[in-house]
Every structure is written in structure tokens, then in C-alpha cells.
């Protein structure tokens, strides 16, 4: 069995997706997603489609990109439904109660499904070379695909904590996936890092009645800066605060505020920091997957920030207006996400109460390992 190259990503809507390379039948794949705390993924349109495409394009699976791969998704045509040649989904439907985006905004069919009104049929997402989505393909439910896609829904998210003086950041998400970067963190994500003097720090995203917040995070950065400036959430010196156009690209550390010149930080007059301790620079760098929006405030409630109703696990909401899909492992090329031998998710904040593990660690380091369950 090849080592699995599991990857995952979250969109600001509170939806997270994971990609798994494992040869299995549809029913086993669906159960695997449930055991992970999610469900077999829909891939409707807009942000959801972009999130899944980002996972696929992050890198080939075990085959090394030499062949087309098939991934189970929550798309099927029930026994009593007919093939509809003029419909975008050809009579197939997504296994969720939420109508989601426009069905016309979907991938094409690699092959036209067989015309039938009697037999239940499943469908897979075919990926050329394992990375480039080609479209949907009808497949008998009892056959084995090369992998599957899971979806997880969270009510609230924590924005990435700003590192400050922290180094060696490591994120562990509730599904036990590991990464060095995560812009939006579901509850249960644990971030560990080293502060100056190699002092370890660990914070956990927890959900409460207000929203989601980083437990044990004092101030708004993981490790306080020795100086006055932060750039892209990290400690900086004044000379490094000018961008390519000469604009001021830093913000002020806790206890400092932007001076009248608009490009230096001075001691807060009354000790009243703006924006929770950060001064507002005249110009901010654009938000990217590796550069969190500096002024981002939290906790983020999905309904507050995105104008939606609150998301709950039983719902299947997708926001279609997100231009960037932040994803785990998004620094440079997305790293293969690994599960840790020591990792345990927090019982009260996982999406569901159980997580998948792998205990045969004879393959390469990319093999998920000791991925134990937690129940609320």
C-alpha cells in the first residue's frame, strides 16, 4: 500500500476539505470521512470547487503524477432517478440537503454516464495526472477509486495567530493533519512554536459562546517582539518596513501606536493601543495565504464576518465569494500533511468525536500515523 499523501484546506466559510489517497470502495470511503468527523465531500461550485481544486493541484499523489486518479465525492444517482442528458449533473445529485451553488457552475463530464433509470450509480472526480481536475465520471459504487474527498463544517474559525518573535510554527488540525501554515483554523487546531530563548509555546483554537479564540494566547501575538514593528505578523526592524513602492508596510507592536509621520511607531500616549494593540499603518500588504491580514480581529464567527447564518455540522453551506482559498501547508508548495505519533485532538472541540489513525508505520514519513480518536 502506498503511503497516503493526505492534504487539507479551509475556506473562510468554515468549510474544510481533505484529500486522501487510498484505494477503496465508495461505501468504505464514505465511512472513512464520517470516522474522521466529516462526510464525503460535495464539490458544488464557487469557493467549494476552488478549495478542492487547490488541494488537487497542490501535488500528485503516490503515483507521482503519471496517471489519472479517481476520487470519490458525494455525487450519485439514486435508483429511482433517470439519467438526464441535458442537465449539468446528468441526473446525479449531491448528497446533502443544502442546494448550494448553481449546478451549471460545475465541472464537465469526462464521459457521458450510461442512460438508466433503475440502477444506482456513483460518480468520481477524475484528476489528470492526479492533480488537474478533468471532470466527473460515472462509476459503479462497488468498484475501487484511487482516493476520496472529505468535507468538514465548523461554526467558527480562528484566524492564524501572528507569530511575532515565534519560530518553528507547527499547526495540528482536528483531523490530525500537520502543517507549517494555516490561515483559518477550525476549533481543535493546536499551534506550537518556539519563542526567544527556545521557550516552547502552545495555543489551541477553542470555540465558546462568543466565537472561536486561541486559548492561552496572551496579547495578540504568539511571542512578543523585542522591538516596535511587525510585518506580516512577524517582528521586524524599521528599515524592513518599507515595501517596493516606499510605502510603510508594518504595524505597531503592543504598547506602541503609529506616529504622526505615518511610518514610525511611538509609545502609546495613554497606554491605549488601537486595534487591540496594533497601530494602523498607512498602507497594508495584501492578504495572501502566507501573509495574514495584519489588522484581522477575532474571534471570527462565520455568520458575523461573512453575513451568513451560523454554520453547524449538519449543514452544508458554502460561500462563493472568497477569492483566495487559504489552505494547510500553503507556504510555497503545499507540503504533504502528516499525522503525528504523539498527536491527540482535544475532546471538546473536534467536529465530531472521532479521528482516523494509522498504526503500521513501515512506509515513508508521509504515512499518517497514530491518528487516534477523540470524542466530545
Amino acid at each position: 500500500e502506498h503511503p497516503t499523501a493526505d492534504r487539507a484546506g479551509c475556506s473562510a466559510s468554515g468549510a474544510c476539505y481533505s484529500l486522501h489517497h487510498a484505494t477503496m470502495k465508495r461505501q468504505a470511503a464514505e465511512e472513512a470521512c464520517i470516522l474522521r468527523g466529516g462526510a464525503l465531500s460535495t464539490v458544488r461550485a464557487g469557493a467549494e470547487l476552488r478549495a478542492v481544486l487547490a488541494l488537487l493541484r497542490a501535488g500528485p499523489g503516490p503515483g507521482g503524477g503519471s496517471k489519472d486518479l479517481l476520487f470519490w465525492v458525494a455525487l450519485e444517482r439514486r435508483r429511482s432517478h433517470c439519467t438526464l442528458e441535458n442537465e449539468p449533473l446528468r441526473g446525479f445529485s449531491w448528497l446533502s440537503s443544502d442546494p448550494g451553488g448553481l449546478e451549471s457552475d460545475t465541472l464537465q463530464w469526462v464521459e457521458e454516464p450510461q442512460r438508466s433509470c433503475t440502477a444506482r450509480r456513483c460518480a468520481v472526480l477524475q484528476a489528470t495526472g492526479g492533480v488537474e481536475p478533468a471532470g466527473w465520471k460515472e462509476m459503479r459504487c462497488h468498484l475501487r477509486a484511487n482516493g476520496y474527498l472529505c468535507k468538514y463544517q465548523f461554526e467558527v474559525l480562528c484566524p492564524a495567530p501572528r507569530p511575532g518573535a515565534a519560530s518553528n510554527l507547527s499547526y495540528r488540525a482536528p483531523f490530525q493533519l500537520h502543517s507549517a501554515a494555516l490561515d483559518f483554523s477550525p476549533p481543535g487546531t493546536e499551534v506550537s512554536a518556539l519563542c526567544r530563548g527556545q521557550l516552547p509555546i502552545s495555543v489551541t483554537c477553542i470555540a465558546d459562546e462568543i466565537g472561536a479564540r486561541w486559548d492561552k494566547l496572551s496579547g495578540d501575538v504568539l511571542c512578543p517582539c523585542p522591538g516596535r514593528y511587525l510585518r506580516a505578523g512577524k517582528c521586524a526592524e524599521l528599515p524592513n518596513c518599507l515595501d517596493d513602492l516606499g510605502g510603510f508596510a508594518c504595524e505597531c507592536a503592543t504598547g506602541f501606536e503609529l506616529g504622526k509621520d505615518g511610518r514610525s511607531c511611538v509609545t502609546s500616549g495613554e497606554g491605549q493601543p488601537t486595534l487591540g494593540g496594533t497601530g494602523v499603518p498607512t498602507r497594508r500588504p495584501p492578504a495572501t495565504a502566507t501573509s495574514p491580514v495584519p489588522q484581522r480581529t477575532w474571534p471570527i464567527r462565520v455568520d458575523e464576518k461573512l453575513g451568513e447564518t451560523p454554520l453547524v455540522p449538519e449543514q452544508d453551506n458554502s460561500v462563493t465569494s472568497i477569492p483566495e482559498i487559504p489552505r494547510w501547508g500553503s507556504q510555497s508548495t503545499m507540503s504533504t500533511l502528516q499525522m503525528s505519533l504523539q498527536a491527540e485532538s482535544k475532546a471538546t472541540i473536534t467536529p465530531s468525536g472521532s479521528v482516523i489513525s494509522k498504526f503500521n508505520s513501515t512506509t515513508s514519513s508521509a504515512t499518517p500515523q497514530a491518528f487516534d480518536s477523540s470524542s466530545a
Epitope: Q27, E31, I356
Partner: antibody, heavy 119, light 108 residues
Framework: EVQLQQSGTVLARPGASVKMSCKAS????????MHWVKQRPGQGLEWIGA????????SYNQKFKGKAKLTAVTSTSTAYMELSSLTNEDSAVFYC????????????WGQGTSVTISS | QIVLTQSPAIMSASLGERVTMTCTAS???????LHWYQQKPGSSPKLWIY???NLASGVPARFSGSGSGTSYSLTISSMEAEDAATYYC?????????FGGGTKLEIK
């Protein structure tokens, strides 16, 4: 015909470990999740965890983490559950069970392995 | 985790009587993932009703199941002696999969 044949009654002392087996036949062992369920005398059913023999993925109920360890040997189509640090609370009947086409209902069950803990 | 509460815990019914038992979930469960099992003393549980309303193979037509969301029920239209057993509801909408405490059905 699908069958799950479990190992026989076990009598063990507190603090010891036991390993029970569940031999599957009549279906492709590596293609389906195998679940384990506990039932204490006169009580209800508790899900312990599951294993996918095809790639050895496992999932545990947090309550049984550290207590139960699930393994599978594909060459013999046999699933195993090892229980460690046994206490009186572990006296129960343990079932192996797997779904087979009924929307994740556990529709095939072994006959159960009875474990009694006594000093 | 989703907690399933069955009521009543114990009930008795006369032969030919209509019997209804309920299963209430602590949060919404998809009807596709709500099932019922029958267990008799000394035997393994048997799948009885799957996906809320589908009778498993060999289950008499006097049994039926219904419900949605957080409320589900199993009904026997006309109680027979062989129906005396304990019935468990079970969900797998969210992991960990959970069972109700059971309803023990006796003959009056």
C-alpha cells in the same frame, strides 16, 4: 454467506491483557471497515472503534483509547482486538461487526466473545 | 457526541396490541443513518430497521419505522410473542457512532 467467527470465552485477572479474534468469511475482508462493540451484562451497546483492513486505518472512541488496540491480518482475514490493563469494568461481551450495504448499519455480527475479569 | 435517549426503558404489551417506542437524539441525525436493532438474551444484536424506515431482510411487515431530525420511532402494528426483545436505536450520522439505552419489550 457472510460470517464473523469470534474466539471463545476469556477469563483474566485485573491488570492483565487479552487479545480476541474475529475471523471473517464470505466477503472481501480488505474492502470493508470492521467495528467492535462492547456490551456489559444487562447493559446497552457501546462502539469501541473500527479498522479498515485494506490499509490499517483505525478509529477509536475516545473512551477506549489506550484500552483497546485494533489490528488485522489480511492473509487470514482476521481482525483482532487487544484489551490492556484490565479491570472489572472490562467484564463484558465484545462483538465484531461490519456493514455490508445497508447505509452503515452494522448488519453482520459475530457471536461475541465473553470476557470475565476476576482475581 | 450524539446522545440517543430511548423511551420507555421497559414496556409490556398484550398480544395483538399496537406498540410504539421512541428514540430522541441530542442533535439532528440524518434519517439515512438512523437504525434499529433487535436483541434477545444470549444472542447478538440483529439489524432490524435501517435508514429509519427500511426493514432488514426477514423482518415481519408488522414492523415499521419513521422519524426525522431528532425524533424517531419504531412501531409494531400487532404485537406477537416473538417480538419480545430489547430494541436499540443507533446513529452513524456523526462519529463516534452511538446507541440508545434500549427499550425492553415484554409480553403482558
Amino acid at each position: 454467506e457472510v460470517q464473523l467467527q469470534q474466539s471463545g470465552t476469556v477469563l483474566a485477572r485485573p491488570g492483565a491483557s487479552v487479545k480476541m479474534s474475529c475471523k471473517a468469511s464470505g466477503y472481501t475482508f480488505t474492502s470493508y471497515w470492521m467495528h467492535w462493540v462492547k456490551q456489559r451484562p444487562g447493559q446497552g451497546l457501546e462502539w469501541i472503534g473500527a479498522i479498515y483492513p485494506g490499509n490499517s486505518d483505525t478509529s477509536y472512541n475516545q473512551k477506549f483509547k489506550g484500552k483497546a488496540k485494533l489490528t488485522a491480518v489480511t492473509s487470514t482475514s482476521t481482525a483482532y482486538m487487544e484489551l490492556s490493563s484490565l479491570t472489572n469494568e472490562d467484564s463484558a461481551v465484545f462483538y465484531c461487526t461490519h456493514y455490508y450495504g445497508s447505509d452503515y448499519a452494522m448488519d453482520y455480527w459475530g457471536q461475541g466473545t465473553s470476557v470475565t475479569i476476576s482475581s | 457526541q450524539i446522545v440517543l435517549t430511548q423511551s420507555p426503558a421497559i414496556m409490556s404489551a398484550s398480544l395483538g396490541e399496537r406498540v410504539t417506542m421512541t428514540c430522541t437524539a441530542s442533535s439532528s441525525v440524518s434519517s439515512s443513518y438512523l437504525h434499529w436493532y433487535q436483541q434477545k438474551p444470549g444472542s447478538s444484536p440483529k439489524l432490524w430497521i435501517y435508514s429509519t424506515s427500511n426493514l432488514a431482510s426477514g423482518v415481519p411487515a408488522r414492523f415499521s419505522g419513521s422519524g426525522s431530525g431528532t425524533s424517531y420511532s419504531l412501531t409494531i402494528s400487532s404485537m406477537e410473542a416473538e417480538d419480545a426483545a430489547t430494541y436499540y436505536c443507533h446513529q452513524y450520522h456523526r462519529s463516534p457512532r452511538t446507541f440508545g439505552g434500549g427499550t425492553k419489550l415484554e409480553i403482558k
